[in-house]
Interface confidence: low
């Protein structure tokens, strides 16, 4: 039968009159344009909502938007237009909201063509009130807040000046022309890219990387010969023309850009890309791009300094640069990523690694489903997920994959199943457990997301005709119940709920359509009734999570230590609440030489866990590049994985020597850097 | 050898629905899908939808959306498609099709497209009060 | 959707000589692309697939080329059964689409 039609299905008590006196519509006095929505701050309930309307005149285009705000998670709503004097807000520059419980908002107008600069409101009471100011410069970009600073903001200007404000954008200055990239580094340092002659893209490969830790009073060129730079984690990353030719090679510090090394990876021509796919204080993953247009590359994952790397995964999926990947990082379990990779014969395949990028496999495939036509073998066959890629290619599928830190175990996807993904309507699948199994939760293509940290799960069915029934699940998805939240039926444009899983509102959002006009419309839903009282101890059950083999002692060790997760029981049908934390037991393992990853100058032959030497290196000195030095190493090819904690057990040799002898890396070499001040 | 018969010709009258079959013999019915195409008098061809033998799953032109079912029976290896709420402009030629690559969403190169290999004789479906 | 245009519309050909029809999609459907022929009152006939290669028992003389979003199907020397109307169709992205049609009539 199909999921939650079966006898096991208990009803939720009397769920109609709980929702129907907890549900909230708001019209908005709107014609239909586009309507954007932002959070401001978290567990503060307010919802800042901008609509616009365009107006296609004969020679110019004439645009209108209000601005609503609420402060109680969207049930009622209060047009706020006139605090920004009624100004037309750009919409592609969003609601810059401020970091944290900053309470601060940028909204960026749209003035006339021949004004001397732009113009934003700012508040910093959370929307109660704004204060107009008028910019010395035309933004290029959305204002950028300091991680560490909310007072602190940067922007670029439309003549490729670096702008910054000490002040929540009251008073701005120049700090520095012709700049492509400008980001925030920790402890308020920026780092950007200068060209020199022409333009950004004319320069693209004789850039400068620099670096002000003063906001502008002082600089330090940290880098040349620069294409592009990223930020991950603790690493910083610059792709580096080479000297003779047309090839470019990563570099990497960890200390703001004052010593970098050459990274252990292959140089990419001007066709091709690198891609930082995830990062953290421990590792990155990185995309290498194949040559030549073939939509893949391959994924390497990195040791704890960013330099030495170990090659993850073969015919990645990533079609061009900026363009599309399926890499997703499962947030609700530890080690856990799932992405595609393009097989021989051009289909997609779904890979999935519970141990941070060390292997990779099918998904398993789920209990309550056929395989499908794509199946070689009816009876094997494995669950394909559809994410960014499928979405590009306007395949029936309305949303990418969810998982949520606080909802341990869960992620929600659309997939299918088969030998690969399928062109056929998909349905909807739920892991409770991270990824290593997988149950069909809905027919069908739907919007969903996760409510209350996992307690409530709520779901929209995916059509193009009108909407009026929404589903939810207090049970992780085995069990559906349906509510009509009106007896008009919207066109449903999207599901809104507070980020962070912790809310226990939804709002739907939409609009009606008669026949003269058409209007936003959003029915926020509060579910606290249905979860009546708060959970306690009996309600939740212990969790272990990586548990493939109970009866192993090592029975759940993922990078070195093991986690026990006090989970709510399905049954239960209670609140986690906003304060809510998830309550977890780490404990530590012996080391494996699954603990280690291949040193530089090794590599892991296929099913094996052994590292063994390259043929090409076999007696060669392993020397490499590091800090602009020549290192020596001793080692018997393993190195910890990042991030791996484990003790005792299996533990490789290894050792570095200095050779103090300098290695040329076609990069600025420390000494060779310099400073200027304002 | 492979092929695919269909049923007979039909006449309908506006409003009511018409169910068309194609039974398949000649290879693995459920190892394949089959699109269904249509034809109106002097005109080209139009794709209508696409089934999954084996799984019973499907995907529907948009403009048939609504209005088309496919169905299929793997015991007697046979797909239906039923068209619902005729119009006189429903007046054509029904084809079943073998469409062995329906298979897998392609990749950014190309995904080897194979055709629709294996064709029925068409059904004829006059729609007229 | 991709739509196809197919030209010309009518193209005029004495026996003997080479036939030249085009194919064009709206966006790219990389090398997606069949070319069907259909004779009157008969079922269309798959003649070239993955663009480029002949169907099982489709005669040398036919020949597809193309990628992206130009086509390219050529008779080199057209035989008296090969008047009839031909079509491009291509499945790179669903709906599934067909070209209007080209019919190669006797000169």
């Known amino acids: 039968s199909a999921p939650g039609e079966d006898e096991e299905c208990g009803r939720v008590r009397d769920f109609v009159a709980k929702l129907a006196n907890n549900t909230h519509q708001h019209v908005f006095d709107d014609l239909r344009g586009s309507v954007s929505l932002s959070w401001v701050g978290d567990s503060t309930g307010v919802i800042l909502v901008l609509t616009t309307f365009h107006v296609p005149l004969v020679i110019m285009t004439f645009g209108q938007s209000k601005l609503y705000r609420s402060e109680d998670y969207g049930k009622n709503f209060k047009d706020i237009t006139d605090l920004i004097n009624n100004t037309f807000i750009r919409t592609e520059f969003g609601m810059a909201i401020g970091p944290e419980n900053s309470g601060k908002v940028v909204l960026t107008a749209e003035v006339s063509g021949g004004s001397r600069g732009g113009r934003i409101f700012r508040s910093s009471d959370f929307a109660k009130n704004f204060v107009q100011t008028d910019l010395p410069f035309h933004p290029l970009t959305q204002m950028m807040y300091s991680p560490q600073n909310s007072d602190y903001l940067l922007a670029l200007s439309t003549e490729n000046g670096l702008w910054v404000s000490k002040n929540f954008g009251g008073k701005w200055e120049e700090i520095h022309k012709a700049v492509c990239l400008a980001k925030w580094g920790s402890d308020n340092t920026i780092f950007f890219t200068t060209y020199a002659n022409g333009s950004c893209k004319a320069d693209l490969g004789a850039l400068e990387l620099w670096r002000t830790s003063d906001l502008g009073k002082s600089f330090k060129t940290i880098g040349v010969k620069i294409y592009s730079f990223g930020l991950g984690g603790r690493f910083l990353f610059a792709s580096v023309m080479a000297d003779k030719d047309t090839t470019r090679r990563i570099h990497v510090s960890t200390d703001q850009g004052d010593t970098w090394s050459m990274a252990q990876l292959p140089s990419v021509g001007q066709e091709q890309f690198y891609s930082i796919l995830a990062a953290n204080d421990d590792m990155v993953f990185m995309h290498v791009d194949e040559p030549g247009d073939t939509g893949f590359g391959t994924i390497f994952t990195s040791d704890d300094r960013g330099i030495v790397y170990s090659k993850s995964l073969d015919r990645h999926l990533y079609t061009t640069t900026g363009g599309e990947t399926d890499f997703t990082n499962v947030t609700s379990l530890r080690g856990v990523y799932i992405t595609s990779v393009l097989s021989e014969d051009n289909s997609i395949q779904t890979m999935i690694t519970f141990d941070q990028g060390g292997r990779w496999t099918h998904l398993r495939k789920p209990e309550n489903s056929e395989c499908d036509a794509t199946a070689k073998n009816k009876n094997e066959c494995s669950l394909h997920i559809h994410a960014s890629y499928s979405i590009s290619q306007k395949l029936n599928v309305p949303m990418a994959p969810l998982s949520e830190p606080n909802a341990v175990g869960i992620v929600i996807a659309h997939g299918s199943v088969g030998d690969a993904i399928s062109v056929m309507v998909p349905d909807v699948y739920i892991s409770d457990d991270g990824g290593y199994s997988w149950t069909k939760m809905l027919e069908g293509p739907h919007y969903y997301t996760i409510l209350d940290s996992g307690g409530i799960i709520v779901a929209i069915e995916h059509s193009s005709r009108p909407i009026n029934v929404i589903k939810f699940s207090t049970d992780e998805g085995q069990c559906w119940q349906t509510y009509t939240f009106t007896r008009d039926p919207i066109y449903f444009t999207g599901l809104a709920s507070e980020p962070g899983a912790r809310s226990m509102n939804i709002s739907i959002w939409g609009f009606t359509e008669s026949f003269l006009t058409s209007q936003w419309v959003s029915y926020t839903i509060d579910f606290k009734d249905i979860l009546e009282r708060n959970c306690e101890e009996k309600d939740y059950t212990i969790w272990l999570a990586h548990s493939t083999d109970p009866e192993d002692y090592e029975d759940g060790c993922i990078l070195g230590y093991k986690e026990q997760f006090l989970r709510l029981r399905k049954s239960s049908v209670c609140q986690n609440g906003r304060d809510y934390v998830v309550t977890k037991q780490p404990s530590i393992c012996l080391c494996s030489l699954e603990d280690f990853l291949c040193d530089f100058g090794y590599y892991r032959p296929e099913n094996d866990s052994k590292c063994v030497e390259q043929p090409e290196l076999k007696g060669h000195d392993l020397e490499f590049c590091l800090y602009g030095r020549e290192e020596h190493l001793t080692t018997n090819g393993y190195r910890k994985i990042p991030g791996d904690k484990c003790q005792g057990g299996v533990n490789p040799v290894r050792e570095v020597k200095d050779l103090k002898k300098k290695c040329t890396s076609n990069f600025l070499s420390p000494e060779k850097q310099n400073s200027k001040s304002n | 050898q492979v092929q695919l018969v269909q049923s007979g010709a039909e006449v309908k009258k506006p409003g009511a629905s018409v169910k068309v079959s194609c039974k398949a013999s000649g290879y693995t019915f459920t190892s394949t899908y089959m699109s269904w195409v249509r034809q109106a008098p002097g005109q080209g061809l139009e794709w209508m939808g696409i089934?999954?033998?084996?799984?019973?799953?499907?995907s529907y032109a948009q403009k048939f959306q609504g209005r088309v079912t496919m169905t299929r029976d793997t015991s007697t290896s046979t797909v239906y498609m039923e068209l619902s709420s005729l119009r006189s402009e429903d007046t054509a030629v029904y084809y079943c099709a073998r469409d062995p690559s329906g298979i897998a969403a392609a990749g950014p190169a190309s995904r080897y497209y194979y055709g629709m290999d294996v064709w029925g004789q068409g059904t004829t479906v006059t729609v007229s009060s | 959707e991709i739509v196809m245009t197919q030209s010309p519309a009518t193209l005029s050909v004495s026996p003997g000589e080479r036939a030249t029809l085009s194919c064009r999609a709206s966006q790219s459907v990389s090398s997606n692309l069949a070319w069907y022929q259909q004779k009157p009152g008969q079922a269309p006939r798959l003649l070239i697939y993955g663009a480029s290669t002949r169907a099982t028992g489709i005669p040398a003389r036919f020949s597809g080329s193309g990628s992206g979003t130009e086509f390219t199907l050529t008779i080199s020397s057209l035989q008296s059964e090969d008047f009839a109307v031909y079509y491009c169709q291509q499945a790179r992205l669903g709906p599934w689409t067909f070209g209007g049609g080209t019919k190669v009539e006797i000169k």
């Open positions: 089934i999954n033998p084996y799984g019973g799953s499907t």
